[in-house]
Amino acid sequence: DAHKSEVAHRFKDLGEENFKALVLIAFAQYLQQCPFEDHVKLVNEVTEFAKTCVADESAENCDKSLHTLFGDKLCTVATLRETYGEMADCCAKQEPERNECFLQHKDDNPNLPRLVRPEVDVMCTAFHDNEETFLKKYLYEIARRHPYFYAPELLFFAKRYKAAFTECCQAADKAACLLPKLDELRDEGKASSAKQRLKCASLQKFGERAFKAWAVARLSQRFPKAEFAEVSKLVTDLTKVHTECCHGDLLECADDRADLAKYICENQDSISSKLKECCEKPLLEKSHCIAEVENDEMPADLPSLAADFVESKDVCKNYAEAKDVFLGMFLYEYARRHPDYSVVLLLRLAKTYETTLEKCCAAADPHECYAKVFDEFKPLVEEPQNLIKQNCELFEQLGEYKFQNALLVRYTKKVPQVSTPTLVEVSRNLGKVGSKCCKHPEAKRMPCAEDYLSVVLNQLCVLHEKTPVSDRVTKCCTESLVNRRPCFSALEVDETYVPKEFNAETFTFHADICTLSEKERQIKKQTALVELVKHKPKATKEQLKAVMDDFAAFVEKCCKADDKETCFAEEGKKLVAASQAALGL
């Protein structure tokens, strides 16, 4: 339905508060370096303009597209050239090229200072002094650091952030109340950002068809009682929502997401029995709840798939005359029967099935050719099962920190060209799969683990894309979205890598390490471990373990010393010499 003024339409649909929040998120995700005050000023100007359009949709410029209005506003920023360099060239373009240009300049790893959490009393004072500014600042800081954060979900995080301060700033022990909540929001926020980044990468790098296939598989697992037409409708609507958010169309995205939640709740009887509680919640909570809802029970009386997709002699006729419906139905039927499989595995099976039909339907005896297609699935299913079993055993044996270290070594040897901070970040996240998924029973391990690994490896892919240094990473990231994890798993030690020159400075530590949190201290040690492997990629596990044990003992000893700095200087030299000898550097 066409509206005379798109901006008025969205303002009315979303309400002023959400409108302003979403415009702030949009601007902060595009201009990630701009100061908070500048963004607030731009948002206020856009909001005032939107109000004039609500009053009179025929007013000047009210008929312009949101991209035109927002782009024009962004291009008024005086310091665009100095701050963003070539991004300023976007402003010379016309829509839709200008928006595409802004999108291409989104930075997954912006050069921004780490967010340091102030003292609780300081935060509570700021919250009470100006609640609105405090919450806007939260949106701004998250959005600029996570330029693909799912905007309507960020509104939900902001609501929880506000609730935490409202409750805890009047608690007897403010810190005990607030800090765990903030930690939880931070961790959930990082996870949410990474999950959405994969959705956007899927759409942008592999196209709508890839995203729709992912959505068919996931929604069929989640709503196995829903019929194919229902799942297809949800997939179409969900694809529109994510295409809009990934494309910077945040007002449309939030509006359409609300409509989708409304539709799902109005039709929950034909979708899932698990939606009742979600649908009783207010909008933001409702949408979040639906997105996280547990899988419904599988319907009774599902016959074997082999009859329709393998045993029938008419498979090729059905495939040839209705390719997308036939393959979509295959994926839907397979996924609803297999909540125990990861989405990426289901997509690999569907791709194998499609490839087999492409080959066999051109053969002399098609039925004979595709008759054993389900046998080809067996190794594809067993590969992630075995990998998860082995890695969960290793995790249970080592614990999270040492498991992360094992992965750090493994991945540094595979792709030693990748920057140390990226290897540390990605390997630490890969290692979290253990505590996240290994506790689950067999039936839930694979969907938990492999789909989580897809999210983490996508982080590696987007960070590497910014500054490509490894052909092997590029190859695994670009060849096939669903085969990324098997591609990385299959990488052996990079024999072409020339070891990094030894630099004593890299292994020089100071007393400041003693005041770091346990997590920060781990990161320091893991950074050193990556550097060790880069210097000595052929080092054995035993050699590396010995050096790391010595290093841990050295840090512990010097942090207990009276003169810490002298200890770090003197003992550090000895440690470097001993390590060099142990590793033959």
Epitope: E227, F228, A229, E230, S270, D301, L302, P303, S304, A306, A307, D308, F309, E311, S312, K313, D314, K317, N318, E321, A322, V325, F326, M329, E333
Partner: antibody, heavy 120, light 107 residues
């Protein structure tokens, strides 16, 4: 409630035509292969044909040419067009839902049937 | 393919164990269903994929077989079980075939 309701049956002269309808409620026809099955008085069940989710129709050998199955997803209805009717086409005509979009069986959901009588 | 059901009629008493067979003219793997039909009603699905019991159907009904030879067994006949039983073969192509039925009556 999930159900199928057939209509359009009645008495027709030999050589005449009839179009039967099967209206679905509680589910979307487009998700399933929809079948027509008939049963002459005191006789066996006889499969006529189906239209699958890809809109491809298949027929029993004896039904090809005289019988045509189609559907209108917007009306959530499947049709059976019967031409050149003969006395031996007298039967109860059932509509039945396949297990999936490309399934030829089994049929868990059936309509109550509509009676067709061909006689002069 | 064709399906041959036997016997075409059968008389039995409440509590009896009853077996009906269905033979396919060619292999249909396990793609066979069994239906129960009572006068004036549409058929009701009892068993699919040769041996899987449809939800809500009493466990006294069971199916077995694969390839060309299939069996429906009622372990202990109840009064409501007197009806006509049909087998259906499916899956080998986009066509399907019914057997001609076995009428089960009270002895």
């Amino acid at each position: 409630e999930v159900q199928l309701v057939e209509s359009g049956g009645g008495r027709v002269q030999p050589g005449g035509s009839l179009r039967l309808s099967c209206a679905a409620s509680g589910f979307s026809l487009s998700s399933y292969a929809m079948n027509w099955v008939r049963q002459a008085p005191g006789k066996c069940l006889e499969w006529i044909g189906h239209i699958n989710a890809g809109d491809i129709a298949y027929y029993a050998t004896w039904a090809k040419g005289r019988f045509t199955i189609s559907r209108d997803n917007s009306k959530n209805t499947v049709y059976l067009q019967m031409n050149s009717l003969r006395a031996e086409d007298t039967a109860t005509y059932f509509c039945a839902r396949g297990a999936g979009g490309f399934s030829t069986g089994p049929f868990k959901l059936w309509g109550q049937g509509t009676q067709v009588t061909v006689s002069s | 393919f064709e399906l041959t059901q036997s016997p075409s009629s059968l008389s039995a008493s409440v509590g009896d164990r009853v077996t009906i067979t269905c033979q396919a003219s060619e292999s249909i793997n396990s793609r066979l269903a069994w239906y129960q039909q009572k006068p004036g009603q549409p058929p009701k699905l009892l068993i699919y994929d040769a041996s899987d019991l449809t939800s809500g159907v009493p466990s006294r009904f069971s199916g077995s077989g694969s390839g060309t030879d299939f069996t429906l067994t009622i372990s202990s006949l109840q009064p409501e079980d007197f009806a006509t039983y049909y087998c259906q073969g499916y899956g080998g192509s986009s066509t399907t075939t019914f057997g001609c039925g076995t009428k089960l009556t009270v002895l």
